[in-house]
C-alpha cells in the first residue's frame, strides 16, 4: 500500500517516500522505485540551510559597501553571508539591508548603551547630580564636580547640561 505520510527528512512524491537533500545540497532528481533521490552541492556563491527538495540554491547575500555594509561572516554552502555595518553605522532594520549613522546624544543626555553594527545608540536623560554638555555617541552623563572634596563651595548650581561651578569658601566670616 502506498504511504500517505513519510518519516522525518523524507517527502512524498508519486506515492513514494523520497529522502530530502541535506543542507548545502539541491535536488537533481526525485527518487523512484529504482533510484535514490539525487542531490548536488550548491556552488560557491550559494547555500541551502535546511533539509530540502529545492531545485535551486539561494544566492548568498551581498554586503554592499555603497550601503555601508561589510561581511561579518562569510557564507558557506549551508549558511547565508552575514552582513554588518561599517564603523560608525548600524543596521536600519533586522534584515540589515542598509546602514545609517549612529545617533548622538544631545547635551542633557548621556549614552546608556553604545551603538553596535546592529543597534543604534541608546540615550538617557542625565539625572540630578549628572550632566552632559556635548553632543556625543560615546559620552555618558558625568557626575557634577564635588566642590567639598576640593575644599571649595558651589558658586553656581549644576544642571543636566552644565557642571557646578566651584569657588573659594568665603573666609570673612
Amino acid at each position: 500500500e502506498p504511504p500517505t505520510a513519510c518519516r522525518e527528512k523524507q517527502y512524498l512524491i508519486n506515492s513514494q517516500c523520497c529522502s530530502l537533500c541535506q543542507p548545502g545540497q539541491k535536488l537533481v532528481s526525485d527518487c523512484t522505485e529504482f533510484t535514490e533521490t539525487e542531490c548536488l552541492p550548491c556552488s560557491e556563491s550559494e547555500f541551502l540551510d535546511t533539509w530540502n527538495r529545492e531545485t535551486r540554491c539561494h544566492q548568498h547575500k551581498y554586503c554592499d559597501p555603497n550601503l555601508g555594509l561589510r561581511v561579518q561572516q562569510k557564507g558557506t554552502s549551508e549558511t547565508d553571508t552575514i552582513c554588518t555595518c561599517e564603523e560608525g553605522l548600524h543596521c536600519m532594520s533586522e534584515s540589515c539591508e542598509s546602514c545609517v549613522p549612529h545617533r548622538s546624544c544631545l547635551p542633557g543626555f548621556g549614552v546608556k548603551q553604545i551603538a553596535t553594527g546592529v543597534s543604534d545608540t541608546i540615550c538617557e536623560p542625565c539625572p540630578v547630580g549628572f550632566f552632559s554638555n556635548v553632543s556625543s555617541a560615546f559620552e555618558k552623563c558625568r557626575p557634577w564636580t564635588s566642590c567639598e572634596t576640593k575644599d571649595l563651595v558651589v558658586q553656581q548650581a549644576g544642571t543636566n547640561k552644565t557642571d557646578v561651578v566651584c569657588g573659594p569658601q568665603d573666609r570673612q566670616r
Epitope: V28, S29, D30, T32, E33, F34, T35, E38, L40
Partner: antibody, heavy 112, light 112 residues
Framework: QVQLQQPGADLVKPGASVKMSCKAS????????ITWVKQRPGQGLEWIGD????????KYNEKFKSKATLTVDTSSSTAYMQLTRLSSEDSAVYYC?????WGQGTTLTVSS | DVLMTQSPLSLPVSLGDQASISCRSS???????????LEWYLQKPGESPKLLIY???NRFSGVPDRFSGSGSGTDFTLKISRVEAEDLGVYYC?????????FGGGTKLEIK
C-alpha cells in the same frame, strides 16, 4: 503504455563513431533515469551508464567513460548514446531501459 | 566494483517443480540511505530482459506470484514456486546500490 523504441541494427566501420537513439513514450521522460546496457553475442549484461533526462546528470561505468557519451533531447523525448573509436569489441546489442521497461535493443556490428 | 556471483550457472528443472537461484555480492549492497537496490530479470532468447523483482522482494506489476525474492546484505535468492514453460530463459540479478552497477553472470533455467 511505456515504450522505449530503438533502431534494430547499425553497421559501422572500425575507428568510426555511432550515435544510437532511444525514443521514450507513454510517460514523462524527465521523471526516470535512462539506463544503457551492453550485451555481446552469447554473453551476459554489462551496465554502461545512466542519464537523468530532467537534469542531464550522468553516472558512468568507469570502463565505458572514454567510450560512451550519454545525452538527452527532451523536446523529442529521445535519449542518445554515442560510441567512439569503434572496434570489433564494440559489436553487441545495446539496450536502453527505464529498468522496469526495456527497449528492444540495437544490434551494432563493427566491420570493415 | 561489486562482483555479483550467480549459482547455479545452469538449472535443469521439470515443469511444476520449484526452482531457486542464488546471487551473492562481493560486499554488502545496502546503500547509504539504508536501501538495497537488488533486481531480478528474465531474458528469453531473442528478447530484451524483463523486470521480475525490484528492491530485493518487490514483485513488478504483472509478474506472477509464483516468483518471489528474498535476502539481505550479500545473499539473495529468487524462487519460482511452480515452474512453467514460459519461465524458461536466463535469469540475471543486478545491483544498483553502489556505482558501478553490476549484473550477475546469469543462470539458465532449462527443462530437465
Amino acid at each position: 503504455q511505456v515504450q522505449l523504441q530503438q533502431p534494430g541494427a547499425d553497421l559501422v566501420k572500425p575507428g568510426a563513431s555511432v550515435k544510437m537513439s532511444c525514443k521514450a513514450s507513454g510517460y514523462i521522460l524527465t521523471t526516470y533515469w535512462i539506463t544503457w546496457v551492453k550485451q555481446r553475442p552469447g554473453q551476459g549484461l554489462e551496465w554502461i551508464g545512466d542519464i537523468h533526462p530532467g537534469s542531464g546528470s550522468t553516472k558512468y561505468n568507469e570502463k565505458f567513460k572514454s567510450k560512451a557519451t550519454l545525452t538527452v533531447d527532451t523536446s523529442s523525448s529521445t535519449a542518445y548514446m554515442q560510441l567512439t573509436r569503434l572496434s570489433s569489441e564494440d559489436s553487441a546489442v545495446y539496450y536502453c531501459a527505464r529498468r522496469d521497461y526495456w527497449g528492444q535493443g540495437t544490434t551494432l556490428t563493427v566491420s570493415s | 566494483d561489486v562482483l555479483m556471483t550467480q549459482s547455479p550457472l545452469s538449472l535443469p528443472v521439470s515443469l511444476g517443480d520449484q526452482a531457486s537461484i542464488s546471487c551473492r555480492s562481493s560486499q554488502n549492497i545496502v546503500n547509504s540511505q539504508g536501501n538495497t537496490y537488488l533486481e531480478w530479470y528474465l531474458q528469453k532468447p531473442g528478447e530484451s530482459p524483463k523486470l521480475l523483482i525490484y528492491k530485493v522482494t518487490n514483485r513488478f506489476s504483472g509478474v506472477p506470484d509464483r516468483f518471489s525474492g528474498s535476502g539481505s546484505g550479500t545473499d539473495f535468492t529468487l524462487k519460482i514456486s511452480r515452474v512453467e514453460a514460459e519461465d524458461l530463459g536466463v535469469y540475471y540479478c543486478f545491483q544498483a546500490s553502489l556505482v558501478p552497477w553490476t549484473f550477475g553472470g546469469g543462470t539458465k533455467l532449462e527443462i530437465k
